[in-house]
Amino acid sequence: SSSPTSSASSFSSSAPFLASAVSAQPPLPDQCPALCECSEAARTVKCVNRNLTEVPTDLPAYVRNLFLTGNQLAVLPAGAFARRPPLAELAALNLSGSRLDEVRAGAFEHLPSLRQLDLSHNPLADLSPFAFSGSNASVSAPSPLVELILNHIVPPEDERQNRSFEGMVVAALLAGRALQGLRRLELASNHFLYLPRDVLAQLPSLRHLDLSNNSLVSLTYVSFRNLTHLESLHLEDNALKVLHNGTLAELQGLPHIRVFLDNNPWVCDCHMADMVTWLKETEVVQGKDRLTCAYPEKMRNRVLLELNSADLDCDPILPPSLQTS
């Protein structure tokens, strides 16, 4: 992923007992929040592995890169980063691994320059549909976000609400059409069983999409047609059995796409014939020579590119009178 990185060489660290300023008060120019390290030269603040339970109120106005990783934030309320004056320069915000289980509507409001957000490795049981759009209007003001990293945000099974986790995430991505400018979206390691059909059509600027290490079985109802700018599509380590003609044609039609398909349990029967033919001709798939069959048993570990139509048969379906129990 592309989490914010820092070129800072010298950080000033505040004393642990420094009292936090009230968010309504502008922080002193050189103030650094308690339990954080600050580098004005690098415009970077790091509050890392400090078990913070809330976002510091006295963040310096100069901050461009903010690391709040490895904390215990639990909830991001509306306006969690709203300050007077606003954090107008904040461009990269990393909240990964901070035990967030709830991100409320408008949590990232008043961050006009926020281009990169990483919420990975948080068990997000409750992600508001308006977490990124900030309002429940049918069309919101465009979000400045360009990169959104949401790897491994699936909560444990017993903490999930009575709704589809995929649906909850997609609702947040689509609300108010605020994320039309998004160019990188990472959704790896989230146990996704399916991809709701609307999601990609409304993210037309995507250049990089990572859906690796999920449990996707099929892409039959997913349309890639509008993703003219898509350059990388990571589908490694899913549960894909075959890609059908419609999907193959759409991927082939994207001018810059490179698709990664390693470690899927490909089923090498008669339904695989079109995909094998396509694989032999396409330059779209990276490492296509590594793709192997998982089923049926007799085909296990066979290389897809080495198969021909005679290899790809389906067991005949016997009429009921001839079937054995």
Partner: antibody, heavy 116, light 113 residues
């Protein structure tokens, strides 16, 4: 980093192939571009090759200039044909950011002189 | 063809004073903000200063800032330093159904008054 080579003196009507060797990153993972600068003049975009090999050119460069890439050698090429005196310039190769459409890494350039 | 017009062609500013360079494109850049600024010193390749219209590249001093959207953009140096003497170029990125196109402005030579 990227480093251009292959420049030199060539006669009008001649051809030349410039190379750009990349190190520290995989060329196939990035869009790469060629930009030139005539002596004492401004920058002029020539064309670009996308990660999967699609190419786009400035209208004046179409037909005479061709961008290609050899992933196994991690090298970018610019083939220039039917060269004219006005093609005399420093030729730069530049890497395009993976998210933004901006040139974030430049070589030092190689000088091409077209003269009889 | 797309034309990018920079103004002025040259500019002389006193040390510590503000310098402003404008860039106008004949068409809107991609997503209204795919506009970059570069600094070039004699004998060197261009150096990226600002991308996405207003985002400062890594290691670039805070006195540089960019603004604008669509077709009109501005580069500002809030307090000119001696090391800022250089030629500055804007560059736009464009997309149409037929593909990608990039264009540079003609450059602005910045000197000390």
């Amino acid at each position: 980093s990227v480093e251009e080579s292959g420049g030199g003196l060539v006669q009008p009507g001649g051809s030349l192939r410039l190379s750009c060797a990349a190190s520290g990153f995989s060329l196939s993972s990035y869009w790469m571009s060629w930009v030139r600068q005539a002596p004492g003049k401004g920058l002029e975009w020539i064309g670009i090759i996308a990660g999967r090999g699609s190419t786009y050119y400035a209208s004046w460069a179409k037909g005479r200039f061709t961008i290609s890439r050899d992933n196994s050698k991690n090298t970018l090429y610019l083939q220039m044909n039917s060269l004219r005196a006005e093609d005399t310039a420093v030729y730069y190769c530049a890497r395009v950011s993976s998210i933004y459409y901006t040139f974030n890494l430049w070589g030092q350039g190689t000088l091409v002189t077209v003269s009889s | 063809d797309i034309v990018m017009t920079q103004s002025p062609d040259s500019l002389a500013v006193s040390l510590g004073e503000r310098a402003t360079i404008n860039c106008q494109s004949s068409q809107s850049v991609y997503s209204n903000n795919e506009l970059s600024w570069y600094q070039q010193k004699p004998g060197q390749p261009p150096k990226l200063l600002i991308y996405y219209a207003s985002t400062l590249a890594s290691g670039v001093p805070d006195r540089f800032s960019g603004s604008g959207s669509g077709t009109d953009f501005t580069l500002t140096i809030s307090s000119l330093q001696a090391e800022d003497v250089a030629v500055y170029y804007c560059q736009g990125s464009y997309y149409s159904g037929s593909g990608w196109y990039y264009a540079f402005g003609g450059g602005t030579k910045l000197e000390i008054k």
